[in-house]
Interface confidence: medium
């Protein structure tokens, strides 16, 4: 059902004239940024952004592609080259080091230069690189980390940790030799490397002693604490600050975020990663949008500003499973969080960036009709006379043979939240992809986000915009509304 007005050239000419008018009026905000927010869509390549845009539009009963995402409204866009020092196609650890610390590293290592070697503990010391979040804290700003994965996962860990192995979530995940050499697990680094004001996400089991029952799943032993050192890291973190509060469910989060006596907040809502949005129990677990709002409420109290990292971390997991439904519903929630943050902050004093760490081998093609379900079938049949979907994967668990042939697929099947899109090559997990990803920017110094850049440039833009090390002599006028 094509809108009749789109058949008229005037429609497109008028729309373009409006866009041109807005572009001509666009003025860079030349002051420093008081606040920094980086939204990280894990695995959110450009094909994912496009497909999520259509899904979000269709959820609003529109045709889809014409309906802008919140991130589409950001005036400045660049491309980010995501390769790591040792791989054409990177992982979330090496990329986090780049966009959060400003230095590219090696595959599976976090917060370390490429002089460090994966899994070799003795290559850690002396190769640490400092995150923008750490520098923001040193400058007197409040800082926060929000994610739908474990808070000890690769992307958020890039903000606070230094490790040669991204999988060292707790000491139980580390070899004895690494522990003896003095390497620390990521959960320990979360509470000891720096003072983080807000920590929201999953990852309870890495904080408590082995066998400690989980408050939400007390009879499920697989969700018990994992720590071999017997420590209660939550208790240790609470003891550091008088105004610290720990919560593990949505109700407690909402109460804590409105309590003026709470200065530090840790919310861990699942033993491991948080639930996919389609599986989330809205009475028990907060959404990414709600966590973002809670974080902003607390962090905004600091007159010197804040740094906030927000990750839609399970977009990546949905893709790894070849389940586009999961990936795209996560991406839509991620965009909802961006929209909410825009309502709660001002672009006059807040630099907001939206980017991805890497892409996925996720494709969107096959000439589907406008307005047809994003999860639907291509209009024609393939050479094997069977239907195929517009969304597909280059590799992954979606490769299936039925009687030696590619299985047929129906519209009903392909629209199911559990459907795995077909793949060309069989793998246990679908892989990341190596093409450039988008960086969207809004706010003070957002105009610096332009062209094709190394991923490590992102951290430098944030540091410069807020006059953080090594750009303390940034020579920028103070942020709007400040007097010093």
């Amino acid at each position: 059902i094509i809108p009749v007005e789109e058949e008229n050239p005037d429609f497109w000419n008028r729309q373009a004239a409006e866009a041109l008018g807005a572009a001509k009026k666009l003025q860079p905000i030349q002051t420093a940024a008081k606040n920094l927010i980086i939204f990280l869509g894990d695995g959110m390549g450009v094909s994912t952004v496009t497909a999520a845009r259509i899904l979000k539009g269709q959820k609003e009963d529109k045709l889809g592609p014409e309906t802008p995402l919140a991130m589409d409204h950001f005036p400045y866009v660049a491309l980010s080259k995501t390769y790591s020092v040792d791989k054409h196609v990177p992982d979330s650890a090496a990329t986090a080091t780049a966009y959060l610390c400003g230095v590219k590293g090696n595959f599976q290592t976090i917060g370390l230069s490429a002089a460090a070697r994966y899994n070799q503990c003795n290559t850690t010391r002396g190769n640490e690189v400092v995150s923008v979040m750490n520098r923001a804290k040193k400058a007197g700003k409040s800082v926060g980390v929000v994610t739908t994965t474990r808070v000890q996962h690769a992307s958020p860990a890039g903000a606070y940790a230094h490790t040669v192995n991204r999988n060292w979530y707790s000491d139980a995940n580390m070899p004895g030799s690494a522990r003896r050499e003095g390497c620390k697990d990521i959960a320990t680094q979360l509470i000891s490397n720096m003072d983080i004001d807000v920590i929201l996400g999953g990852g309870r089991k890495y904080m408590f002693r082995m066998g400690a029952p989980d408050p939400e799943y007390p009879h499920d032993y697989s969700q018990d604490g994992t720590r071999m050192d017997g420590k209660n890291l939550v208790q240790e973190w609470l003891a550091k600050q008088q105004g610290a509060r720990y919560v593990w469910n949505r109700t407690e989060l909402m109460q804590a975020s409105l309590d003026p006596s709470v200065t530090h907040l840790m919310g861990l809502f699942e033993p491991g990663d948080m639930k996919y949005e389609i599986h989330r129990d809205p009475t028990l677990d907060p959404s990414l949008m709600e966590m973002t709002e809670a974080a902003l409420r607390l962090l905004s109290r600091n007159p010197r500003g804040f740094f906030l990292f927000v990750e839609g971390g399970r977009i990546d997991h949905g893709h790894h499973e070849s389940r586009a439904y999961r990936a795209l519903t996560e991406a839509v929630m991620f965009d909802d969080a961006i929209e909410r943050a825009g309502q709660l902050t001002s672009e006059e004093d807040t630099l907001t960036l939206v980017t991805a760490d890497h892409s996925h081998v996720f494709s969107f093609g096959a000439y589907p009709l406008r307005g047809s379900s994003i999860f639907g079938l291509a209009p024609g049949k393939a050479q094997d006379r069977k239907a195929y979907t517009a969304l597909l994967y280059g590799n992954g668990p979606g490769y299936v043979l039925k009687d030696g042939a590619r299985p047929d697929v129906t519209e009903s099947e392909s629209g199911s939240p559990e459907y795995r899109q077909q793949a060309a090559v069989p793998l246990d997990e679908e892989t990341h992809a190596g093409e450039d990803v988008a960086v969207f920017a809004r706010g003070p110094q957002a105009h610096l986000v332009h062209g094709v850049q190394e991923q490590s440039f992102i951290a430098h833009v944030m540091a410069f915009a807020a006059c953080l090390e090594p750009y303390t002599a940034c020579d920028l006028a103070p942020p709007a509304g400040t007097t010093d």
Epitope: K275, P282, E418
Partner: nanobody, 121 residues
Amino acid sequence: QVQLVESGGGLVQPGGSLRLSCAASGSIFSVNTMGWYRQAPGKQRDLVAVATSGGTIHYADSVKGRFTISRDNAKNTVYLQMNSLKPEDTAVYYCNLVVPYGMIAGDHDYWGQGTKVTVSS
């Protein structure tokens, strides 16, 4: 070990109704997708309806407006209310449980034994 027990199948006249239920027992993580698939004689197994623990519901086009899926999370049970039944709804109906364990590509898939539904005058 997880077990799925279906009930409610039987013989019904065209235009009639049936209610299928499927109870899951064993070690079940609270995050899951429960649903119904059916297999007509000589055909492949097709999706009928699924419902996730977060409230997402999806129906096959052929049953939309006639069938309603619902679940009782406390009882780990999923129901399928089938109204305005047609002869082409005749099939063995299978209950399905998908449990995502938070590990990438690590979902556990469980199936019931099936319950026969015959729509005939």
